[in-house]
């Protein structure tokens, strides 16, 4: 079934048809479009059976149309559906305005419906003239355009119309008067020299095609000097002028045949430059340095004359480029006074001569060779020398005994110190120093130096040997060691080694608590920053333990008896006797005796009583083994 035909306007020159129909039923549809008043022949369209809508363009504006449609199914035509609709009114332009006005251009703005026009046709016509109008077209999407290339201070009529394929709107018009040609701004002279000046001027950017500059000597009928420069410039150097001369300079701008009113300025060029401030300083002992002042870019060259004050005949002449303001004059005699003269040349003209006197320095010297910071393998050298003269210094190091190869160093003439290393310790050296300049070798100066000895660890000595220990002592260089390690090992290696760490200032260690009568090995090492010296070694045997022996009882009496004993000579400080009755019926008796004694009479005991006697010696606070005996007092 074909039904629901609707027709809507699509703009002012088209209609849109929509209808409904069963899916996949129709081979095609036939559409007929006819003006309602049947003025023009009907338009027929055949569209595929899959469509349910179609746009019909290219119709007349504001016109009623009758639209019919029928479908074809296997050659069968459905009943016709019809509808009526009108196209829209043709669009009009809105308003046109001149947004910006210059002296040679303007900006045109207008309003118009979106998408209505393919392009706009704009006509620019000078008012009150028969000159041909300027025509231009702009795309239909634009609403603004610049109109360049106009005349200054001129009335224009501008019309615009919108155009489609078969239609053009009613034109809109606007009238406008272009601005006057802009005037130049200020003309100033910013720099004046004796032969040139610099002009600066102001003007709106992008206005002028070019500028014409006229330079005329004031009060002179001579032909003026004309220059034409691009319109982008705002500054110009005018060279080739005469010194101390008044000039009139005029400037006008030109734009598309128009010329501005000229600007003028008067200026006087500077007087011819003079040389000034000639200064002469010594450059070492064989040269002088000249400095002078002069105007920049003024001189073609300078002529310098150098002669010894006392020798008028022998003068040196030099010609130098005009860009220089200083020069070194080498190859002179040391400690000699010189007169130096200079003049400049400007386009053949000579400036007045400037003169000065100066003396060269004394011949360079070296001295005060000094040796410092001596170590076992190195030392530092320092010396004095005339500054800025020497290219190199030569240092020779020779050992006094001539056993080693001579070492030679060549170092920069700027140096005043050197570090000499890689030398053997405890060695005498002679150091020779000489300076070399391009045309001189100084006399040689010398100094002596002796490298320090390596830090020593020596003379391990064992003293105060006794049964229980001994004293270890050694010699070492001052401040050479952080610490010492003393290791004591019994010769039979039966006991654990004993290790003693001592500060680097100590030089002895008293060892006690050793075993009597055995051999020991003692090793002493020094340490510097954790590095160990090879040890000094010594072997020692402790003395045998001193003995008390042969305790004898004699001469018994009712109240006592005599005791005697033997002991090592010179070992014991004293002896201790302990006496007690064997039945322990009385308090024990303890007697301390001085070392030399070997006998003692004991009295005050009970008669006919058995006593137990013990004896031991004391040496340096230690007890010897005890010896015992039994004794009985006589009957009363």
């Amino acid at each position: 079934e074909l039904e629901n035909l609707t027709v809507t306007e699509v703009g002012w020159d088209g209609l849109r048809l929509n209808w409904t129909a069963a899916d996949q039923a129709y081979e095609h549809f036939i559409i007929q479009v006819q003006e309602a008043n049947k003025v023009e022949a009907a338009r027929n369209l055949t569209v595929p059976g899959s469509l349910r809508a179609v746009d019909i363009p290219g119709l007349k504006a504001a016109t009623p149309y009758t639209v019919s449609i029928y479908g074809v199914i296997q050659g069968y035509r459905t009943p016709v559906l019809s509808a009526e609709a009108s196209t829209g009114e043709t669009p009009n332009l809105g308003e046109v305005v001149v947004a910006e006005v210059g002296w040679d251009a303007l900006k045109l703005n207008w309003t118009a419906p979106e998408g209505a026009y393919e392009y706009f046709f704009i006509q620019v016509q000078e008012a009150d003239t028969v000159e041909a109008a300027q025509n231009l077209t702009v795309p239909g999407g634009l609403r603004s355009t610049d109109l360049p290339g106009l005349k200054a201070a001129t009335h224009y009529t501008i019309t615009i119309r919108g155009v489609t394929q078969d239609f053009s709107t009613t034109p809109l018009s606007v009238e406008v008067l272009t601005e006057e040609v802009p005037d130049m701004g200020n003309l100033t002279v910013t720099e004046v020299s004796w032969d040139a000046l610099r002009l600066n001027w102001t003007t709106p950017d992008g206005t002028y095609d070019q500028f014409t500059i006229q330079v005329q000597e004031a009060d002179q009928v001579e032909e003026a000097h004309n220059l034409t420069v691009p319109g982008s410039l705002r500054s110009m150097e005018i060279p080739g002028l005469r010194a101390g001369t008044p000039y009139t300079v005029t400037l006008h701008g030109e734009v598309r045949g128009h010329s501005t009113r000229p600007l003028a300025v008067e200026v006087v060029t500077e007087d011819l430059p003079q040389l000034g401030d000639l200064a002469v300083s010594e450059v070492g002992w064989d040269g002088l340095r000249l400095n002078w002042t002069a105007a920049d870019n003024a001189y073609e060259h300078f002529v310098i004359q150098v002669q010894e004050v006392n020798k008028v005949e022998a003068a040196q002449n030099l010609t130098l480029p005009g860009s220089l303001r200083a020069v070194d004059i080498p190859g002179l005699e040391a400690a000699t006074p010189y007169r130096v003269s200079i003049y400049g040349v400007i386009r053949g003209y000579r400036t007045p001569v400037l003169s000065a006197e100066a003396s060269t320095a004394k011949e360079p010297e070296i001295g005060n060779l000094n040796v410092s910071d001596i170590t076992p393998e190195s030392f530092n050298l320092s010396w004095m020398a005339t500054d800025g003269i020497f290219e190199t210094f030569t240092i020779e190091i020779i050992d006094s005994n001539r056993l080693l190869e001579t070492v030679e160093y060549n170092i920069s003439g700027a140096e005043r110190t050197a570090h000499i290393s890689g030398l053997p310790p405890s060695t005498d050296f002679i150091v020779y120093l000489s300076g070399l300049a391009p045309s001189i070798r100084t006399k040689t100066i010398s100094a002596t130096a002796t490298t320090e000895a390596l830090p020593l660890l020596e003379n391990l000595t064992i003293s105060d040997i006794n049964p229980y220990g001994f004293t270890v002592s050694w010699m070492a260089s001052e401040n050479a060691f952080d610490s010492f390690l003393v290791t004591v090992v019994d010769s039979g290696k039966l006991l654990d080694p004993q290790e003693f760490t001592l500060s680097g200032t100590q030089r002895k260690l008293e060892l006690r608590g050793l075993i009597t009568g055995i051999g020991y090995e003692v090793m002493v090492s020094g340490f510097t920053q954790g590095h160990q010296t090879k040890p000094l070694r010594a072997e020692i045997v402790t003395e045998a333990e001193p003995e008390v022996d042969n305790l004898l009882v004699s001469d018994a009496t009712p109240d006592g008896f005599r005791l005697s004993w033997t002991a090592d000579e010179g070992v014991f400080d004293n002896f201790v006797l302990k006496i007690r009755d064997t039945k322990k019926q009385s308090e024990p008796l303890e007697i301390t005796l001085l070392a030399p004694e070997r006998t003692r009479d004991i009295t005050g005991l009970r008669e006919a009583t058995e006593y137990e006697i013990e004896l031991y010696g004391i040496s340096k606070g230690r007890r010897s083994q005890t010896v015992s005996a039994i004794a009985t007092t006589a009957m009363g």
Partner: antibody, heavy 118, light 108 residues
Framework: EVQLVESGGGLVQPGGSLRLSCAAS????????MGWVRQAPGKGLEWVSA????????YYADSVKGRFTISRDNSKNTLYLQMNSLRAEDTAVYYC???????????WGQGTLVTVSR | SSELTQDPAVSVALGQTVRITCQGD??????ASWYQQKPGQAPVLVIY???NRPSGIPDRFSGSSSGNTASLTITGAQAEDEADYYC???????????FGGGTKLTVL
């Protein structure tokens, strides 16, 4: 486990200064002497400086004397090297190292690179 | 002098014995210490004192000293022993630590 971690290296212009730090752990810092050793690119080891346990004694190689200062903060277990007036020839990897009283440097950090260049 | 002199390079066949030497006046008084350094790593102490090895150092490394020369001996060199070896000593209070120039050991 003994650990020494250096920091503070970097790029510096000749004449400039840097301060290196070495954070220590895993041993009794206050009982160890400490030191700095450097190694220029492609070159051998060069001892630079050392300091005793409590920081009262310091030692320097001739090449850095008067320019470098070694110090330590036992409360922070940290060793320092203040480097002033740096020269191009001071460019190197700087290692922090420890040594107990009776042996040389027995533990080293992984190093920090100091580059002295314009 | 306190400069310790080492051969720049030494090579050894795998499993063979190699001796690296170090010469200097300071070695008359002090024992040398020896460090192994592999590329991109910090040095490792391998021998110090008369012939002491820190824990973890294989017993194929040993040290000896005679006169002004110290020696590091590797008995049965392994591929992992390929490294730079630096000797190190003291020269007393002014030059407390001195390193040799290093020896590059190649294990073939």
């Amino acid at each position: 486990e003994v650990q020494l971690v250096e920091s503070g290296g970097g790029l510096v212009q000749p004449g400039g200064s840097l301060r290196l730090s070495c954070a220590a752990s895993g041993f009794t810092f206050s009982g160890s002497r400490m030191g700095w050793v450097r190694q220029a690119p492609g070159k051998g080891l060069e001892w630079v400086s050392a300091i005793n346990e409590e920081g009262g004694q310091t030692y320097y190689a001739d090449s850095v004397k008067g320019r470098f200062t070694i110090s330590r903060d036992n409360s922070k277990n940290t060793l320092y090297l203040q480097m002033n007036s740096l020269r191009a020839e001071d460019t190197a990897v700087y290692y922090c190292a420890k040594h107990p009283p009776h042996r040389p440097f027995d533990y080293w950090g992984q190093g920090t690179l100091v580059t002295v260049s314009r | 002098s306190s400069e310790l002199t080492q051969d720049p390079a030494v090579s050894v066949a795998l499993g063979q014995t190699v001796r690296i030497t170090c010469q200097g006046d300071s070695l008359r008084l002090y024992y040398a210490s020896w460090y192994q350094q592999k590329p991109g790593q910090a040095p490792v102490l391998v021998i110090y004192g008369k012939n002491n090895r820190p824990s973890g150092i294989p017993d194929r490394f040993s040290g000896s000293s005679s006169g002004n020369t110290a020696s590091l001996t590797i008995t049965g060199a392994q591929a992992e022993d390929e490294a730079d070896y630096y000797c190190n000593s003291s020269h007393g209070p002014r030059r407390p630590v001195v390193f040799g120039g290093g020896t590059k050991l190649t294990v073939l």
